[in-house]
């Protein structure tokens, strides 16, 4: 199983295919969106190991930054994620794909910076309310992934300055109507809901009125539930190892998972000369699993000290979450100490610690 076959789209972000090498793709994402950059191998051939770089610095994978050989995902993007991204061949540092990414304010209704659209003296003596930025109110249907922040705005003016109130599905909408509460920013004519959930779906209406009249606008919100997936394991890890008797070995496993992953290291063993159990599945013993004072980071590394010939064999990194499992295996070959020099000369693949 490789990352290529395991990787699933997180949320509902559109995947952006990579530009031709040398071209720079200009991309704009909304705050809170999932930024997805894809860089398929040129001509569809093998690409070899790659690295993703932002503003000249290699990207470090994290819960929010998911790095694969041909795809980069940055979840819950913010202004700080704006910049120049490139996918490069690890060995040659040749740029395979180049993107210019800009993350703008809230994805919902094309906001400007806070502070704009505040109530202003328009110079009109008296008058009914009117929209000051109707072009910003075109997007009446909003579909956003769960956990994102949504902001609806109805920038208006009038004299006297109108008031604004909000309805959900035709009824008065107040903070206590949702678990996360709401933020009403009257000066910015906005309603903000953080970390939306499916129960936030519905029609939201702003009502702007003064003594000379009333205007209203209705937005429809759809909350897209994440389609959860089993963990993703970085391709090529753990890697096969050859070690000299008595040396130390480390196997590495990189796990990406939306849901809390559970990581185990297993060793394939024989029982009474058989490698498989009565039901035909391979016998394994658990070498490392979540336990007292073991962090997820520590679980991504299996350390074997002072290896013996009994340590040779197949090792499996197994990662599971509530949806399913993924696993990658690697082999350890243990060589006798006296072969160390010969093997090192011939292959350069012997690790003596």
């Amino acid at each position: 199983e490789s990352l290529g076959t395991e990787q699933r789209v997180v949320g509902r972000a559109a995947e952006v295919p990579g530009p031709e090498p040398g071209q720079q793709e200009q991309l704009v994402f909304g705050s809170g969106d999932a930024v997805e950059l894809s860089c398929p191998p040129p001509g569809g051939g093998p690409m070899g190991p790659t690295v993703w770089v932002k503003d000249g610095t290699g990207l470090v994978p994290s819960e929010r930054v998911l790095v694969g050989p041909q795809r980069l995902q940055v979840l819950n993007a913010s202004h700080e994620d704006s910049g120049a991204y490139s996918c490069r061949q690890r060995l040659t540092q040749r740029v395979l794909c180049h993107f210019s990414v800009r993350v703008t304010d809230a994805p919902s209704s094309g906001d400007d910076e806070d502070g704009e659209d505040e109530a202003e003296d328009t110079g009109v003596d008296t008058g009914a309310p009117y929209w000051t930025r109707p072009e910003r109110m075109d997007k009446k249907l909003l579909a956003v992934p769960a956990a994102n922040t949504v902001r609806f705005r109805c920038p208006a003016a009038g004299n006297p300055t109108p008031s604004i109130s909000w309805l959900k599905n035709g009824r008065e909408f107040r903070g206590e109507h949702r678990i996360g509460g709401i933020k009403l920013r009257h000066q910015q004519w906005s309603l903000v809901m953080e970390s939306v959930v499916p129960s936030d779906r519905g029609n939201y209406t702003c009502v702007v009125e003064n003594k000379f009249g009333s205007i209203r606008q209705t937005y429809t919100l759809d909350v897209l539930e994440r389609s959860p997936h089993r963990p993703i394991l970085q391709a090529g890890l753990p890697a096969n190892q050859t070690a000299v008797l008595g040396s130390d070995v480390e196997f590495h496993c990189k796990v990406y998972s939306d849901a809390q992953p559970h990581i185990q290291w297993l060793k394939h063993v024989e029982v009474n000369g058989s490698k498989v159990g009565p039901d035909g599945t391979p016998y394994v013993t658990v070498l490392k699993t979540a336990g007292a004072n073991t962090t997820d980071k520590e679980l991504e590394v299996l350390s074997l000290h002072n290896v013996t010939f009994e340590d040779a064999g197949e090792y499996t990194c197994l990662a599971g979450n509530s949806i399913g499992f993924s696993h990658h295996s690697a082999w350890l070959v243990v060589l006798p100490a006296e072969e160390e020099l010969v093997e090192a000369d011939e292959a350069g693949s012997v690790y003596a610690g």
Epitope: H262, V276, D279, Y283, N293
Partner: antibody, heavy 127, light 108 residues
Framework: QVQLVQSGAEVKKPGASVKVSCKAS????????MHWVRQAPGQGLEWMGW????????NYAQKFQGRVTMTRDTSISTAYMELSSLRSEDTAVYYC????????????????????WGQGTLVTVSS | DIVLTQSPATLSLSPGERATLSCRAS???????LAWYQQKPGQAPRLLIY???SRATGVPARFSGSGSGTDFTLTISSLEPEDFATYYC?????????FGQGTKVEIK
């Protein structure tokens, strides 16, 4: 949503058999071992055994050997536990419970804590 | 079989108090293979702690587990009304899987 839904309550006569079902949803049924645990009224929890839904392999607690049969139907993501030769002391709530064991391996040691449980099925054995 | 003995059998406390529940094994258990469950009347058990000290998904931070070898502890730092229930420890170090007899935490 990951869940296990069990069949309804049963009343059986001593000597009879009972078959309890456990339907899984929201995850890949064949990937996780399924265990069965029972709880007599006012008592603690007692492990009965497991089934590997992928291979059909089973492992029963010594106490239930010969009386219990665990099976599965992968086409409908359902596990079954049948207990025969019922006696009054088998009156209990029977739970199916999913574990973090990957069904493509045969584990020689522990790690089977139960992260998802069915709601339980009350089996009453009475003459 | 590994026998798990929980103490006390019943713990009478008030909301806001600290609860300390003990689980003692008849032989050594790897901390990776000890778990704690919460059960309320008429409900299935719910996984709280696995690997002796790792909180299961969605379990509040007031629950913590510790211990190694033969002595393990579940601590509830400040009892909430919904925490009054019966708690079971479980070992999966050796077959068969065994549970403690339970500690009932009741409102004083």
């Amino acid at each position: 949503q990951v869940q296990l839904v069990q069949s309804g309550a049963e009343v059986k006569k001593p000597g009879a058999s009972v078959k309890v079902s456990c339907k899984a949803s929201g995850y890949t049924f064949t990937s996780y071992y399924m265990h069965w645990v029972r709880q007599a009224p006012g008592q603690g929890l007692e492990w009965m055994g497991w089934i590997n839904p992928n291979s059909g392999g089973t492992n029963y607690a010594q106490k239930f050997q010969g009386r219990v049969t665990m099976t599965r139907d992968t086409s409908i993501s359902t596990a079954y536990m049948e207990l025969s030769s019922l006696r009054s002391e088998d009156t209990a709530v029977y739970y199916c419970a999913r574990t973090w064991q990957y069904s493509y391996f045969y584990y020689l040691d522990g790690g089977y804590y139960f992260d998802i449980w069915g709601q339980g099925t009350l089996v009453t054995v009475s003459s | 079989d590994i026998v798990l003995t929980q103490s006390p059998a019943t713990l009478s406390l008030s909301p806001g108090e600290r609860a300390t529940l003990s689980c003692r094994a008849s032989q050594s258990v790897s901390s990776s293979y000890l778990a704690w469950y919460q059960q309320k009347p008429g409900q299935a058990p719910r996984l709280l702690i696995y690997g002796a000290s790792s909180r299961a998904t969605g379990v509040p931070a007031r629950f913590s587990g510790s211990g190694s070898g033969t002595d393990f502890t579940l601590t509830i730092s400040s009892l909430e009304p919904e925490d009054f229930a019966t708690y079971y420890c479980q070992q999966t170090n050796n077959a068969p899987v065994t549970f403690g007899q339970g500690t009932k935490v009741e409102i004083k």
